[in-house]
């Protein structure tokens, strides 16, 4: 049913939902912090623009009781009920922050009217792309997936000279929420990725995964999996691995390969790195420290949603344009506004845009070197380390087929 | 009313250090991000440094391991402190704060300090 917005005559507010299942465990203190000093910093953008209107957000807790479980596998049904319990208490904002687990956004997109922006830090799944009022501001899945076929196809630089068509995939179930949704989408037939691939096999067993490590009739050097140097270390221990192999670890939400006294430990040798592109410092936040690298990009994009609803509430109030319209709802999208920590591009369907970095370990430092960059806003790839000291014959990476000549 | 007020530019030898100053208005300081640009005679006026809100800072090619921007939250003030000055660092530094406008530059500008590297 139509909830009416307190979104008019000069107060905004923002209806923020403080999900007990969350894509990352933080506490929703935290949360509440990041979204409070955003408040601050978007009262002062306003007031500098001679724009004398209040901002606030309101904090919509769910009780609890039955969507206990602290992950997204509850997540359903907990967004629901909290929609429910805007829509009885007529407390509905200009914009709704919160879901952040793939199947609560998808299902509260599904089941409300299209007349408001949902923000979302997270909602990785391939099923909330392409929603016209959703906004995600961390790497959604499709970004992971482009980059990798464009990697996959690229065979012009001078430490890879083939293209590949193949891969394995390791997905055991126990991922955290991120990951879950970018294997799920390297993992779904129909995605773009699989679609590009000429083989593609998922292991699920630890078993699996270890034995493709030194079995000769494998098909395919490439692995892809997704976590920190710690999670591949469990599985793979000091094993022996076959000199073609190739490891592709998917680790977006973690600079810790950037620290200067970091040494790369000896199992990383065969794995390239994916993370994103580093500098989510948050240096002087209140609400940042003691918090992990990951839960730092959570807590910014929270703080990023509050200064993107200021970024839109400016420019509308500038035209002088209404706010609970259809246009405010759709407006969410293509543009660049600043954020947190730098400036932040959404792409045409409100999807975040990034550098990724692919990183190697040198032979030569035991350091994480960047090998490339890739540009999600334009899909394009660019190569950094032309001679890199690879662990990999000739400094080149393997062909994705053994025996199998140059294409 | 914005104010940006640079200062610390003076006359220094080659290897020498400078801190520059820019004290803000709080109302823009809390909010924005901001830059310092320097303009050498005859040059076209470049971005030297840029700090955001989160303390995160990045660099033009030229100053890189020798410039350091930061930031004091309760002065509302942005240092550029230089080290390893040589000649060609000679400009007036400016400091910008604000929102973004449409030529890809603040909306605020200081009225500059000059540095002069020079035995």
């Known amino acids: 049913s139509q909830v009416s917005q307190n979104c008019h005559n000069g107060s905004y507010e923002i209806s923020v939902l403080m999900m007990g299942n969350s894509a990352f465990a933080e506490p929703l203190k935290n949360l509440e912090d990041a979204v409070n000093e955003g408040l601050e910093i978007v009262r002062g953008r306003l007031q500098n623009a001679g724009l004398n209107v209040t901002v606030n957000a309101t904090f919509m807790y769910s009780d609890g009781l039955i969507h206990n479980s602290g992950d997204c596998r509850s997540s359903t049904c907990e967004g629901l009920d909290l929609l429910r319990k805007i829509s009885n208490a007529q407390r509905m904002g200009c914009v709704l922050i919160g879901p952040s687990c793939t199947y609560s956004t998808f299902q509260m997109y599904l089941d409300t009217e299209l007349s408001y922006p949902m923000i979302s830090a997270g909602s990785f799944g391939l099923s909330c792309d392409y929603k016209e009022t959703l906004t995600r501001l961390m790497s959604p899945a499709r970004k992971l997936m482009y980059f990798l076929v464009n990697f996959w196809k690229t065979n012009d630089l001078p430490f890879k000279t083939y293209s590949w068509s193949t891969s394995y995939v390791y997905k055991n179930g126990t991922e955290t929420e991120d990951c879950f949704w970018y294997l799920n989408a390297l993992e779904a037939s129909v995605s773009y990725f699989s679609h590009e691939l000429g083989f593609k096999v998922v292991l699920r067993q630890d078993k699996e995964f270890q034995d493709i490590l030194m079995d000769h009739n494998r098909k395919s050097n490439v692995i892809i999996m997704c976590g920190g140097p710690e999670f591949l270390y469990k599985l793979k221990g000091d094993r022996a691995v076959a000199e073609d192999i190739v490891i592709i670890l998917v680790d977006l939400f973690n600079d810790q390969y950037f620290e200067d006294n970091v040494t790369a430990p000896d199992y990383m040798k065969n794995v390239l790195v994916l993370t994103l592109s580093p500098g989510n410092s948050l240096l002087n936040s209140s609400f940042s420290r003691n918090l992990s690298p990951t839960k730092r990009d959570f807590a910014l994009a929270y703080l990023n949603g509050i200064l993107l609803f200021g970024h839109m509430l400016k420019i509308f109030l500038e035209n002088g344009e209404n706010i609970t319209t259809p246009k405010f709802a759709h407006a969410f999208r293509n543009l660049t506004f600043e954020g947190y920590d730098g400036p932040v591009t959404l792409d045409d369907w409100g999807d975040v845009d990034s550098t990724m970095v692919l990183l190697y370990t040198s032979v030569d430092t035991k350091k994480y070197k960047v090998l490339l960059t890739y540009d999600t806003h334009v899909n394009k790839t660019y190569p950094v380390d032309m001679s890199p000291t690879f662990t990999w014959k000739n400094s080149k990476l393997p062909n994705d087929i053994t025996g199998r000549g140059p294409q | 009313q914005v104010q940006l007020v640079e200062s610390g530019g003076g006359l220094v030898q080659p290897g020498g250090s400078l801190r520059l100053s820019c004290a803000a208005s709080?109302?823009?300081?809390?909010?924005?991000?901001m830059d310092w640009y320097r303009q050498a005679p005859g040059k076209q006026r470049e971005m030297v440094a840029t700090?955001?809100?989160?303390?995160?800072?990045t660099y033009t090619d030229a100053v890189k391991g020798r410039f350091t921007i930061s930031r004091d939250n309760a002065k509302n003030t942005v240092y550029l402190q230089m080290n390893n000055l040589k000649p060609e660092d000679t400009a007036v530094y400016y400091c910008?704060?604000?929102?973004?406008?449409?030529?890809?530059?603040?909306?605020?500008w200081g009225q500059g300090t000059q540095v002069t590297v020079s035995s």
């Open positions: 910008n704060a604000g929102p973004t406008t449409a030529s890809s530059v603040r909306q605020y």
């Open positions: 709080s109302n823009i300081f809390r909010a924005y991000g």
């Open positions: 700090i955001w809100l989160s303390g995160r800072s």
